[in-house]
């Protein structure tokens, strides 16, 4: 057993670990060359070269020219060839393959289940607040406010179907007009794209993998945002979606039909229902303005109930509210009437974990949020690992060719449309665009699916989720049939319009370019991905919502200057790229602005310092816990983190580069923390860094 077990698997040729590493890794500075360190037992430990994938220099350094990070990586097969194996090896290989496939299915199942639980957790944490957003009817007549309400609610409940069903019931009960509901539906479309973006964050371990995964996930976001950017003003001006859906409803006579088959739910429900079950009606009741629902818990306690209709004496505001004059009386002060009241008799409790805990919704939500994110993260890592080991050589080539190759020459353009159909079909089968796009994200990350192919698949997924909604609408009761169908059709035509805007002409495939740009920035500054998520899905909608509460004049007064500034920046950016000659010298680049206004570098420095401080505190805790554990179990071989030393000691000690545990490619998960002091300064003062500008 080596004194530093984490370093045992240090690769002799570290360049193999990183794509596009052109030459050997930068050597260790002279001052460190002769130094060696001693471990706890006093034996000297040789200085070990830091693997590139864990080197701050290589990670932040941009790939060399001519090596496109968007090129799909070659998934080489380093294993023994089939022909070279003996029969025992072949059998073992087959069993190994079967085992991997079963494990892959298992982790995929857990992954989908954790997405379901994550949605429930979000509903427990923010569901009631989401319902309250809807109960503010006066604001929702403002299309911009409606849009951000749709975004916020869907982000909070992590389910566009929940927000859509609330909208449907509000329209059906005349609390909301179809016209006011359309922007909310658009917002729900945006909100649903957060799920796969969260999933992409889990792949932050490897920069190139993260670049692809994050771009693949955000292509969905950009498509939705850009579609709204064009179609919301168009809808506000012309009401084309409302008119078109009205025309469709009047042209075709729709009969009540069957709901879409819940294939995935059938498989996942038995497991997720053991974890948590929610009463989704509570959010709906809050949205409909039921004040009593605010005090109800979202956690379902009773799964089997019997409804008894009984006649009950109830007070009413005036005799006009009586059931009939014959069933109307007074007690001298209040007017009473007889009403049929459905009383629920509880028969059997639900069988989930939290059924007997008297914990508040928020506490259960936070517990589930944490656990589901951990499981999601774990499953993702395992799926990526398993796919990485399965998709090698011949298999990888076949799959990549199948997924990414276009049809022969005259029909090449049809490939994308087939991908749209495949995306729609797959989403229709799994009944959730979130599940489909989230499952696709790791595949984009490891390079099985290209961004160019992921884009039409995502667009198809958007269509698939609306066809599901149309079928669900057709299965709804008579009183809500028309409104639910019209809203589902609005959703459908909105996505169709979006596809017509941003897909048919390759030049207009702006979401791909924007997603790649964001992928590049996020690969370099990984914190930016989190910032993007919070800024676009939470802060911006909340700000717009707040301004909407203040009224139209305030919203316009604040919004117009911001929009004008953005347009100005975009125009200037276009001119800088296309025809800089017409611009004055000063405006040909962004250097006339302070660095922090056009580069993420200063922000990165601040965040790096902040996280290093946090990391040190965190490591200290880990180290104390570790020491305690060692004392308790009497284990002499276990090593505790070295990142928690006095600053004086830190200055004396030399910097030892350390390879993270082989199990993960994620630096955040490494067992040993590097000494921060000098290392951090070096990272910040690196010459190799190029300032990636935001603009």
């Amino acid at each position: 057993m080596a004194p530093w077990p984490e370093l045992e698997n240090a690769h002799p040729n570290p360049n193999k670990f990183i794509e596009g590493a052109s030459g050997p890794q930068s050597s260790i500075p002279d001052k460190d060359k002769g130094t060696s360190k001693t471990n706890d037992s006093g034996t000297p430990v040789a200085k070990i070269e830091l693997l590139p994938s864990y080197s701050a220099l290589v990670l932040i350094e941009e790939p060399p020219e001519g090596n496109d990070p968007w090129d799909l990586p070659e998934l080489q097969d380093n294993g023994i060839k089939w022909s070279e194996r003996d029969s025992k090896g072949k059998i073992l290989c087959i069993f190994q393959g079967i085992g991997k496939f079963i494990l892959l299915l298992g982790f995929l199942y857990l992954f989908v289940c954790s997405l379901d639980v994550l949605s429930s957790a979000f509903q427990l944490v923010g569901g009631k607040m989401a319902g309250q957003f809807f109960s503010n009817n006066s604001i929702m007549s403002n299309p911009v406010a409606g849009l951000v309400i749709g975004v916020l609610v869907t982000v909070m409940v992590q389910s566009s179907s929940t927000s859509s069903s609330i909208i449907v019931s509000m329209v059906a009960s005349s609390l909301l007009s179809v016209r006011a509901a359309i922007p909310i539906i658009m917002g729900a479309n945006i909100g649903t794209s957060i799920t796969n973006t969260i999933v992409a964050l889990m792949q932050a371990g490897d920069r190139n993998e993260f670049r692809r995964a994050f771009a693949g996930a955000t292509v969905h976001d950009f498509f939705n945002w850009l579609s709204v950017l064009v179609l919301l003003p168009l809808e506000a001006a012309t009401h084309y979606l409302e008119k078109l859906t009205n025309l469709v409803l009047e042209t075709f006579s729709f009969q009540n039909g069957e709901d879409a088959p819940d294939i995935l739910k059938v498989i996942t429900d038995p497991f997720t229902k053991l974890i948590i079950q929610l009463d989704k009606k509570v959010i709906q009741q809050i949205a409909m303005g039921d004040s009593e629902a605010q005090n109800k818990s979202l956690i379902k306690i009773w799964c089997k109930t019997i409804s008894n209709v009984i006649e009950e004496n109830v007070t009413v505001p005036s005799p006009d509210n009586c059931t009939s004059p014959s069933y109307c009386w007074t007690d001298g002060i209040q007017t009473w009437t007889i009403q049929n009241v459905t009383e629920k008799e509880n028969i059997a409790k639900c069988q989930h974990i939290f059924v007997n805990f008297s914990l508040p919704d928020l506490a259960v939500g936070i517990i589930l949020l944490t656990v589901s994110l951990l499981i999601l993260c774990g499953c993702l890592i395992m799926i990526v690992k398993l796919l990485g080991s399965v998709l090698r050589g011949q298999v990888a080539t076949v799959i990549k060719k199948t997924l990414n190759t276009d049809f022969p020459f005259p029909f090449a353009w049809l490939t994308g449309y087939l991908a749209i159909l495949v995306g729609a079909g797959m989403t229709f089968i799994v009944q959730s665009s979130s599940v489909f796009t989230s499952a696709m994200t790791p595949l984009i990350g490891i390079g099985v699916i290209s961004i160019e192919r992921a884009y039409p698949l995502t667009l198809g997924s958007n269509i698939g989720t609306t066809t599901t909604a149309i079928l669900a609408a057709l299965a709804s009761p008579g009183n809500t049939l028309r409104s639910s169908l019209q809203i589902a059709l609005c959703h459908f035509f909105f996505n169709i319009s979006g596809i017509l805007l941003w897909y048919p002409i390759p030049f207009t495939r702006l979401p791909i370019r924007l997603a790649k740009g964001l992928g590049n920035i996020s690969a370099k500054y990984r914190w930016f991905a989190v910032f993007y998520l919070i800024f676009f899905f939470l802060l911006t909608p909340l700000t717009v919502f707040g301004l909407s509460l203040a009224g139209w004049p305030v919203l316009v007064g604040v919004g117009v200057p911001i929009i004008l500034l953005i347009l100005l920046v975009l125009c200037l950016r276009m001119l800088q790229a296309r025809c800089p000659r017409i611009l004055p010298l000063k405006l040909r680049d962004w250097n006339f602005l302070p660095l922090w206004m056009h580069s993420l570098k200063p922000w990165d420095n601040i965040i790096s310092l902040a996280t290093s401080c946090f990391q040190r505190r965190c490591c200290c805790c880990c180290r104390v816990c570790c020491r305690v554990c060692c004392m308790v179990c009497g284990c002499k071989c276990c090593r505790c983190s070295k990142c928690c030393k006095n600053l004086e000691e830190e200055e004396k000690e030399q910097d030892v580069p350390v390879k993270a545990s082989g199990g993960f490619d994620n630096t955040a998960m490494s067992k040993e923390c590097q000494d921060e002091g000098k290392g951090q300064v070096e990272v910040l003062g690196m010459k190799a860094l190029s300032n990636t500008t935001v603009f």
């Epitope: 004496n313 005799p319 001298g332 002060i333």
Partner: antibody, heavy 119, light 107 residues
């Protein structure tokens, strides 16, 4: 058992006010309405109004609106009925009666208070 | 206001007789009708509510019937203590109103 005890007889001059009290016992005071009904000599019963002691909510017969005020004191479980601007035709026996929960029938009555209005 | 008209205004009967008093409402009151008995110098006493429901402690010889606009109070076998004035009352709507009363006398 439920008991409603009213204040004694009153003789008032026209234009004056009278305040009749009704002390209750034997039940939860705040759960039932309390009605006031009057009966002029040799005449039928006439409803004046009602009060819900739980909230202080009141309802008055339009005929007496502006002249009648009903109050309740939960600390002593007593209700009061004040009739102002008395006229000779207000001479009557005034009864307090407990309303049955949820409807306007009156199950328990006080013994009555004779109010005589004469100059 | 809803008017209640009782008939007859006076009624003479003997002990053991079956007596019926009627009460007509000027509009539909459903079953929101109560019947009271009042003896001279005493406070009224509730007999029937909801047109047909006997109040606790009221003898079974008293019964009520009717709905809508016509109601009846029936005493199946008159007893000496039953000679008094009987009032019907509606509580369908405010203001609560009483009938003018039916005086039951010994023949």
């Amino acid at each position: 058992q439920v008991q409603l005890v009213q204040s004694g007889a009153e003789v008032k001059k026209p234009g004056a006010s009278v305040k009749v009290s009704c002390k209750t016992s034997g039940y939860t005071f705040t759960t039932n309405n309390m009605h006031w009904v009057r009966q002029a000599p040799g005449q039928g019963l006439e409803w004046i109004g009602a009060i819900y002691p739980g909230s202080g909510a009141t309802a008055y017969n339009q005929k007496f609106k502006g002249r009648v005020t009903m109050t309740a004191d939960t600390s002593t479980s007593t209700v009061y009925m004040e009739l102002s601007s008395l006229r000779s035709e207000d001479t009557a026996v005034y009864y307090c009666a407990r309303g049955m929960y949820g409807h306007g029938a009156m199950d328990y009555w006080g013994q009555g208070t004779l109010v005589t209005v004469s100059s | 206001d809803i008017q209640l008209t009782q008939s007859p205004s006076f009624l003479s009967a003997s002990v053991g007789d079956r007596v019926t008093i009627t009460c007509k409402a000027s509009q539909d009151v459903g079953t929101a009708v109560a019947w009271y008995q009042q003896k001279p110098g005493k406070a009224p006493k509730l007999l029937i509510y909801w047109a047909t429901t006997r109040h606790s402690g009221v003898p079974s010889r008293f019964s009520g019937s009717g709905s809508g606009t016509e109601f009846t109070l029936t005493i199946s076998s008159l007893q000496p203590e039953d000679f008094a004035t009987y009032y019907c009352q509606q509580y369908s709507s405010n203001p609560l109103t009483f009938g003018q009363g039916t005086k039951l006398e010994i023949k």
